[in-house]
Each structure stands twice: as C-alpha cells, then as structure tokens.
C-alpha cells in the first residue's frame, strides 16, 4: 500500500511541478522593474522569456514579442532551451508514469515492467526539475549581474546637465514559480524512484530445506518471485509473497483533480 501511495503522490507532485514549469515558462514576469523606494511608478517594465511588457499607470499594457532569434542574448536562449527541455522531459515522464501507476491496469503488464517505467519516469522528472531549476537560476544570476552593473552606472550624466535614468530589473514572480515548480518535479521524481524499489520483484535465494525420506533424500526449494530486475539483491528480511495474490491491485485509486493557480 505504501508503494502505491508513494508512486501516486510522486505522480501528483510531479504533475503540479510540471504544470508550474509550463506556467513559469509562459509568464511575462521573469524580470520586473526595480522600484527602489517608490512603490508607485508611472511606467512599469517587466520581461519574460518570449516578450517584454510595459504597464502604464493609466492601466494601458503593451507587450512586444522578441521577434529576433540571433539578436537575443545567448544566456536567454540557454534559459529558453533549459525550460523547454524540462517541459518536454516532464511531459514524457508524465506519460510514462501514467502507464506505470500501480493503481492502473493495462493488459497483463508485469510488475517488473511497471517498476522499470516508474524508474524511467522518476529519472525524467528529476532531470526535468533540474533543468527548470538550472534555467531559473541562470536567469536569476544574469539579473543579479545586470542589476549591480546598472546600479554602478545608475545615472549616466551627459555634460553634467542631462541625466538618463537606467531601468534596473529585479526578480519577477516567474522565477519563484520556476524554483518551486522545479523543486516539486524533482521531489516527485525522487518519490517515483523510491516507489520503483518497492515495485521491483526481487529474486528470492532461500536456503534449501532438506526433507529426509526413507531410502533417499529430496531437496525442496520453495518457489520465489519470477525474476530479478537487477535493482540489487538484498537477502535480509525478505518477504515471501504469494505470486497470485495482488491485494493492492484489487482496490483502484483514481488521481484527484487539482486546481493550478
């Protein structure tokens, strides 16, 4: 039961995480104008991975897409790539994990196959989460560097008369969404990998029990699980399962709906 719960929870956590990664990638507020000590601004700038926006205090908002590919900073391209890789891996991981769920029966799929699929999806979620965290962190680092550079050149005086106020940018909401979502996907992936160990049918190497009959001796080995899946052979505290009984499979649990904000 614990294995099913761990696998189910891992799936749900990863699902929320990947939804968050998608949301973060699409959000416009990766970097927002630093307002210093002034919370009210007449013109507020914010930028995403795909477009930059300006919101006036009049309420008018205008967004412009980055219609150039070659003209964009390499770091921004790298962040985009990391986030997309994260989404793609996560989506594939979700697809694989659906079929791997213990509570869902697909034909006569063996537990070893489900274990392998659970491990695969788990690894995919881990890599997906790491991609998202890396992408967000690279962007955050870029912001910090630019922030201090623009602080150093806060006012570029022209002949000491005219001043140009440089717009400084700070962390936007998307960065925090991305970090949390990446973390959740990572946690979900770890949970799937843990669940995989519980799902894995292990080869039982029980010591032979000798029964001495009159005239000759017969060595009898009780039947264990079918085949080892190669996840390690721990002979300590092995449980003997009835090969035919599948108590956890009898009760099907359906994943509940979640609202993503």
């Amino acid at each position: 039961m614990a294995v099913t719960a761990c696998q189910g929870l891992g799936f749900v956590v990863s699902l929320i995480g990947i939804a968050g990664i998608i949301a973060a990638t699409c959000m416009d507020q990766w970097s927002t104008q630093d307002l210093y000590n002034n919370p009210v601004t007449a013109v507020f700038n914010y930028q995403g991975l795909w477009r930059s926006c300006v919101r006036e205090s009049s309420g008018f908002t205008e967004c412009r897409g980055y219609f150039t590919l070659l003209g964009l900073p390499a770091m921004l391209q790298a962040v985009r790539a990391l986030m997309i890789v994260g989404i793609v891996l996560g989506a594939i991981g979700l697809l694989v994990s659906i079929f791997a769920l213990k509570c869902i029966r697909i034909g006569s799929m063996e537990d070893s196959a489900k274990a392998n699929m659970t491990l695969t999806s788990g690894i995919m979620f881990i890599v997906s989460g790491l991609c998202a965290i890396a992408g967000v962190s690279v962007f955050a680092n870029m912001l910090v560097t630019n922030f201090w550079m623009s602080t150093a050149n806060m006012y570029t005086g022209m002949g000491g008369m005219v001043q140009t106020v440089q717009t400084r940018y700070t962390f936007g909401a998307a960065l925090f969404v991305g970090w949390v979502a990446g973390g959740l996907t990572l946690i979900g992936g770890v949970m799937m990998c843990i669940a995989c160990r519980g799902l894995a049918p292990e080869e039982t190497n029980y010591k032979a029990v000798s029964y001495h009959a009159s005239g000759h001796s017969v060595a009898y080995k009780p039947g264990g699980f079918k085949a080892s899946t190669g996840f390690g052979s721990n002979t300590k505290n092995k449980k003997i399962y009835d090969g035919g009984a599948r108590t956890e499979d009898e009760v099907q649990s359906y994943p509940s709906k979640h609202d993503y904000v």
């Epitope: 007449a42 013109v43 009049s58 106020v165």
Partner: antibody, heavy 118, light 113 residues
C-alpha cells in the same frame, strides 16, 4: 459623453479648509485614475496627486503631502480633494483630470477657483 | 523631480506660418521597455482647462487637427503647428508623463503676428 463636473468657486480665510468635488459621468468611474492638478495665477501647472476609484489607493506629490487629501464616493462617482491649513499661496484654479493611455490627461474638469484671503 | 523647460516663453507667428515650440527635460523620458517617449503636449485657452494634443511625444489625440505634430526623443522635444490658424492662439504646455511627480513646462504663449 465623458464629463468631469467640479464644484463652484470658494473663498476661504487663511488656516481654513476647503473640499472640492469632481463628479464623473459618461464612463466607468472605477476604471481610471483620477488626478488633481493646480494652476496658480501666472504659474505653471502643478500635479497634486491621484486616486484610484476602484481600490482607493492614492499617490501624492511630496510638495502636497499634508496639504491635500484625496477621497472618493464610488456610489456617486465623485472624487474629492480637501485642502487644509490654507494660505494665500494656495490661491489657484484646481482641476481634476482623468488619466488615459500615454499617462496623459484626456478629460479635465472645468476647474474650481479657490481664493484664500483675509 | 524632472524639470521641464520650454522655449521660447512667448512666440508670435503670422497666420498660415509654421510655429515651433521646444521642450527640454532634465532626464530622459524615453522608456527602454517600449521605446516610447513619455512626453505630452497640451493647449490651454484663457478661462479653459488644458486640452490634450499629443502623447507619447508624437501620437496625436483623436480629434486634434493634423497641423499639430510632435517630435523628439530622450530629452529634447518639439511641437510644430504647420500652418497657424486663429484658433491656435493659446498657451502650450509640455508634461513629463514618465515619472511621478508629473511635471509641466512653464508654458509657451503663442500669438498671431
């Protein structure tokens, strides 16, 4: 048709207070910031502050903090500006204006003349 | 605060002639996010409130005759009336619409020569 109708002229003694109203019609009152601007005789226009009719949030020019207080009555689609501790230099025409695209004022009230004299 | 300085203080132009009013700001009014200049021009006739002519330095407000045009970027801006009409006699103000507090120029009085 968008209209901003202000209250009539006021004559006040130094130290007194005055409350100027600005009734909006012809548009959704809660969708636009309402700004107040003053024009003293022979002087340039001066921005006093603004209030958002939906949230009630305000922002003032430092020069007018403590002098002007912006309030509103959403149900009556009316914005108010109260000026306290009046002095002769507060004698001016006070305008309410609606903020639009480009952070520009597209509609203005007709102006309220406040005269402060002893 | 951004200081807005207009020149000249007064201007006399013959009917049908071109009138040019300049406005200079102490800080750039160009917003890098959308490459728009947050400068507004108003016209004020005696006993009337100001009337919006141009916003974003060069975008004409609807209903404003096309003889009015705005230009400039950063800190230097110009309002041009291509062919002066009698009804254009007024005081013209430029306004910083980029940062609070909004500030106005001292005004330029336009008269007919």
């Amino acid at each position: 048709e968008v209209q901003l109708v202000q209250s009539g002229a006021e004559v006040k003694k130094p130290g007194a207070s005055v409350k100027v109203s600005c009734k909006a019609s012809g548009y959704t009152f809660t969708s636009y910031w309402m700004h107040w601007v003053r024009q003293a005789p022979g002087q340039r226009l001066e921005w006093i502050g603004m209030i958002h009719p939906n949230s009630g949030s305000t922002n003032y020019n430092e020069k007018f903090k403590g002098k002007a207080t912006l309030t509103l009555d959403k149900s009556a689609s009316t914005a108010y500006m109260e000026l306290s501790s009046l002095r002769s230099e507060d004698t001016a025409v006070y305008y309410c204006a609606r903020l639009k695209t480009g952070n520009s004022f597209d509609y203005w009230g007709q102006g309220t003349t406040v005269t402060v004299s002893s | 605060d951004i200081v807005m300085t207009q020149s000249p203080d007064s201007l006399a132009v013959s009917l049908g002639e071109r009138a040019t009013i300049n406005c200079k700001s102490s800080q750039s009014l160009l917003n890098s996010g959308n490459q728009k200049n947050y400068l507004t021009w108003y016209q004020q006739k005696p006993g009337q409130p100001p009337k919006l002519l141009i916003y974003w330095a060069s975008t004409r407000e609807s209903g404003v005759p096309d003889r009015f045009s705005g230009s400039g970027s950063g800190t230097d801006f110009t309002l041009t009336i291509s062919s002066l009409q009698a009804e254009d006699v007024a005081v013209y103000y430029c306004q910083n619409a980029y940062t609070y507090p909004f500030t106005f120029g001292q005004g330029t009085k336009l008269e007919i020569k």
